[in-house]
């Protein structure tokens, strides 16, 4: 059962698996949630009554029951770890602590001239947890304006104490807001020769690679495969670090692999859910229960269920046995990963599904595309939505994409002559515009978000938000499509679509099915001699075949041009101007989404 | 009917510098692009740049870029052309045209040009 | 730059012959080419646009042709006030350039 309430003055007694210091019951809550057993928590905050030592523990715990005996205690407050919730979760902390001192190694210090400054330097440092910043009224002259910026084991400060005149709070790489460059690469018969923080067991490179991410400390890992030669290793995940935050030495060999931290792609792909199935491999581990089920998939959804299930080995049933069931253990241990890896024994294995809701839903995979055609299928584009206007009398507007469960992100100037968000309506989960009828469920729009630097589409910025009266339950036919990272600003997108209801050509009327085209990206040199009297800035990007004939064209306004990577699909760009439609040359040009994310998450997150 | 009408003949001396008005009539000023091209005497036609008046926005030919300033007051509909430290073979009619396209394409309507003779 | 070589120079042709002028592309230019006549102390008037679309009010007697690099203008029934300069331009890719021209003379 979830619960999200906060229970005051109450202490829960036993089940203690380890302490942490955190600034908040809140953040505690959050801590419990992705500790890989923590199903219950007691924060103490500060008192009188209290001893100042015992400020801010958050004492994490567990129980084979899902609960614990509860104790009236003053200034304790206690809760549940949102394991047990269906709901999204996210880490993100933007919260700033006043006259809060967090404790941690002190490894670089600068002037900054705001905490908000010292909060930046921190989300784009590496090895950055957690920063401490003197403001300008600190007593000690030469401390003032200081911003301390630090790190520990387990990415929670290692005391907290009271401190006036200073603020703290935590890296927001967390909150997609990093700089940092995005590394998808996984490097073959490579070891990374670096100090190791922690090991644990992995049936493949990638699961790895997303421990690794979820790893306060580690930066990049390395990995042996099970035909490693030295069997002890095998399946072994190696989270390391190194002072620079890239690796010192690769070495060449043979069946091992290595990688990096995806701590600033995470928004876009997913680094908690581990979702594939693992064929004659059994997972080790501490026996939680045994039950029968009728396939490897049904066991992972028995262990998706039981909320401390972390991982399961689920062996099929011998010929006519139990019903033709097979036999599900369902497994844990003191990290969330197996304590063994075996191969050879018939077993499937899996882990929880648990953690998904860790991931962006965005991330999801989506059914296969249809190749060829330009008529789209059901479920094919499930973030795109088509905007009305019901003024003077119903019509399709723009295209627009989810990106939240309240949100869409669509053009500024879709909105032209718009008076009031009252006459738009957001349709969802459609494939034909026919389908639209009076007794149609749609969302209405509480509020139009425009970039207050958009003027006209040409001139960029053409980029709006609408916030949605309702909340969009995400099925397969709606749901969000992720944002671009800030690390892959480099990426080269190379499998691009855009779709739309739009005209197919000039002077055309609005399609009935929704249109797809694959189209080239363009770049912003060779876009810029396409339109010589507008400045194609790096807030654009430019798509469009040489030889014309697909693009974007009136009423795809707005809609997306999405380009998959990764096996994940991401919002690049929004379709905003050009000249005609599918003009011979002139590329189609979109506001550029990767540098608006910021300035989405600010309005999108906002309190 | 769309018109552009430039301003008189100009007389300059090497080093000075010139600058050519272009209005514009019977159209939406800020939809379409102002170029500028130029024809010395007896010679073919060069492309000196582009004004977007809607957007303020300017591109150049290189062989121009560090003397030639293109800018447009929308209030009254004009375009100007300066071209700043003048040498004899900058003598040329110059002339401004609307393209046909709304992002630059062919120039459909031409200014009468205006004639600029530089000589000490 | 893109470079637009003219060709020929100049060309007389009888009344009510065909005229032909040639214009090559030192890059392909895909289709975006126009072509303008000139006559002395006149601004240059727009004939074709995009290798083949007569503008607003041109003679069906004048045609555009053409792909890539190499373009065409045909004038199939010359008449005495087709005299006058044709320059073709390309606008492919900023800057627009012009070709040299081409001189155009009854015989």
């Known amino acids: 059962e979830c619960v999200t309430q906060l229970l005051k003055d109450t202490c829960f007694e036993g089940g203690d698996i380890t302490t942490v210091f955190t600034p908040s019951a809140k953040y505690c809550q959050v801590v419990c949630t992705y500790h890989p057993r923590c199903l219950l928590f007691t924060f103490t905050a500060e008192s009188p009554s209290e001893d100042p030592t015992r400020w801010f523990t958050c004492v994490l715990k567990d129980s084979v029951t899902e609960t614990l005996p509860r104790v009236n205690r003053t200034a304790a407050i206690s809760g549940y770890s949102f394991k047990q919730c269906s709901h999204q979760i996210s880490a993100c902390n933007k919260d700033i602590y006043v006259d809060l001192d967090m404790k941690g190694i002190n490894y670089n210090s600068s002037v900054a001239k705001s905490a908000q400054e010292c909060q930046e330097r921190c989300t784009d440092d590496v090895h950055c947890h957690f920063f401490t910043y003197a403001t300008r009224q600190f007593p000690s002259l030469e401390h003032r304006n200081i911003c301390l910026l630090k790190h520990t084991q387990t990415g929670t400060p290692t005391r907290i104490t009271k401190l006036d005149k200073v603020v703290s709070g935590f890296s927001l790489k967390s909150c997609a807001l990093s700089n940092l460059a995005c590394i998808r690469d996984i490097f073959p018969n490579t070891v990374f020769a670096d100090s190791n923080i922690d090991s644990v067991m992995a049936p493949d490179a990638f699961v790895c690679g997303r421990i690794c991410t979820h790893h306060p400390g580690c930066l990049f890992f390395t990995f042996f495969s099970q035909e490693w030669p030295k069997e002890s290793q095998r399946n072994l995940c190696l989270l390391k670090t190194s002072e620079s935050g890239l690796p010192s030495t690769r070495i060449k060999k043979s069946k091992a692999l290595s990688g990096f931290s995806l701590q600033s792609c995470r928004h876009s792909i997913p680094v908690f859910c581990h979702s594939s199935f693992y064929h004659d491999t059994d997972f080790l581990g501490e026996e939680l229960d045994i039950v029968a089920a009728k396939s490897h998939e049904a066991c992972q959804k028995l262990c998706t269920n039981a909320v401390r299930c972390q991982f399961f080995t689920y062996t099929p049933a011998q010929a006519s046995c139990n019903e033709g069931k097979g036999k599900c253990y369902l497994k844990l241990s003191s990290n969330g990963s197996p304590t063994k890896i075996l191969h050879g024994r018939g077993g499937i294995s899996g882990y929880t599904l648990r953690l998904c809701k860790m991931d962006n839903e965005c991330t999801t995979k989506i059914k296969p595309r249809i190749v060829g055609g330009t008529a789209s299928v059901r479920g094919e584009w499930p973030w795109q939505v088509t905007l009305h206007t019901t003024s003077p009398t119903q019509r399709h507007l723009c295209g627009g994409s989810i990106i939240g469960n309240q949100w869409i992100l669509t053009a500024a100037h879709c909105f032209y002559g718009v008076e009031s968000p009252k006459i738009l309506r957001v349709y969802s989960g459609i494939l034909n515009q026919s389908e639209i009828k009076e007794d149609t469920s749609f969302f209405g729009v509480q509020e139009i978000i425009i970039h207050d630097q958009y003027k006209m589409a040409e001139s960029g910025y053409d980029i709006a938000l609408l916030k949605l009266e309702t909340t969009v339950n995400y099925t397969d036919s709606q749901r969000p499509i992720c944002l671009p990272s800030k690390g892959d600003r480099n990426v080269i997108y190379t499998d691009c679509w855009v779709t739309g209801w739009g005209y197919r050509k000039l002077r055309d009327k609005i399609q009935n099915t929704l249109q797809k085209a694959k189209i080239p990206l363009v770049t912003n040199e060779e876009c810029q001699k396409r339109y010589r009297g507008h400045k194609i800035t790096h807030k654009m990007i430019c798509a469009g075949y040489r030889e014309g004939g697909k693009d974007a064209c009136k009423g795809d306004s707005g809609g997306p041009l999405s380009c998959k990577h990764n096996e994940v699909w991401h919002l690049v760009g929004i379709t905003s101007w050009g000249e005609g439609c599918a003009q011979r040359e002139r590329p189609g040009v979109y506001t550029n989404v990767v540098e608006y994310v910021d300035w989405i998450l600010e309005k999108t997150q906002a309190v | 009917q769309v018109q552009l009408v430039q301003s008189g003949a100009e007389v300059k001396k090497p080093g000075a510098s010139v600058k050519v008005s272009c209005k514009a009539s019977?159209?939406?000023?800020?939809?379409?692009?102002i170029e500028w091209v130029r024809q010395a005497p007896g010679q073919g036609l060069e492309w000196i740049g582009v004004?977007?008046?809607?957007?303020?926005?300017?591109n150049y030919n290189e062989n121009f870029k560090d003397r030639a300033t293109l800018t447009a007051d929308t209030s009254i509909s004009t375009a100007y052309m300066e071209l700043s430290r003048l040498r004899s073979d900058d003598t040329a009619v110059y002339f401004c045209?609307?393209?046909?396209?709304?992002?630059?394409?062919?120039?459909?309507?031409w200014g009468q040009g205006t004639t600029v003779t530089v000589s000490s | 730059d893109i470079v637009m070589t003219q060709s020929p120079d100049s060309l007389a042709v009888s009344l009510g012959e065909r005229a032909t002028i040639n214009c090559k592309a030192s890059?392909?230019?895909?289709?975006?080419v126009a072509w303008y006549q000139q006559k002395p102390g006149q601004p240059p008037k727009l004939l074709i646009y995009?290798?083949?679309n007569r503008y607003t009010g041109v003679p069906d007697r004048f045609s555009g042709s053409g792909s890539g690099t190499d373009f065409t203008l045909t004038i199939s029934s010359l008449q005495a006030e087709d005299v006058a300069v044709y320059y073709c331009?390309?606008?492919?890719?900023?800057?627009?350039?012009f070709g040299g021209g081409t001189k155009l003379e009854i015989k």
């Open positions: 019977g159209y939406t000023f800020t939809n379409y692009l």
């Open positions: 331009q390309q606008d492919y890719s900023s800057p627009p350039t």
């Open positions: 890059q392909s230019v895909s289709n975006d």
């Open positions: 995009y290798i083949s």
């Open positions: 004004i977007n008046p809607g957007s303020g926005y300017t």
């Open positions: 045209a609307r393209t046909y396209g709304k992002y630059g394409g062919a120039m459909d309507f």
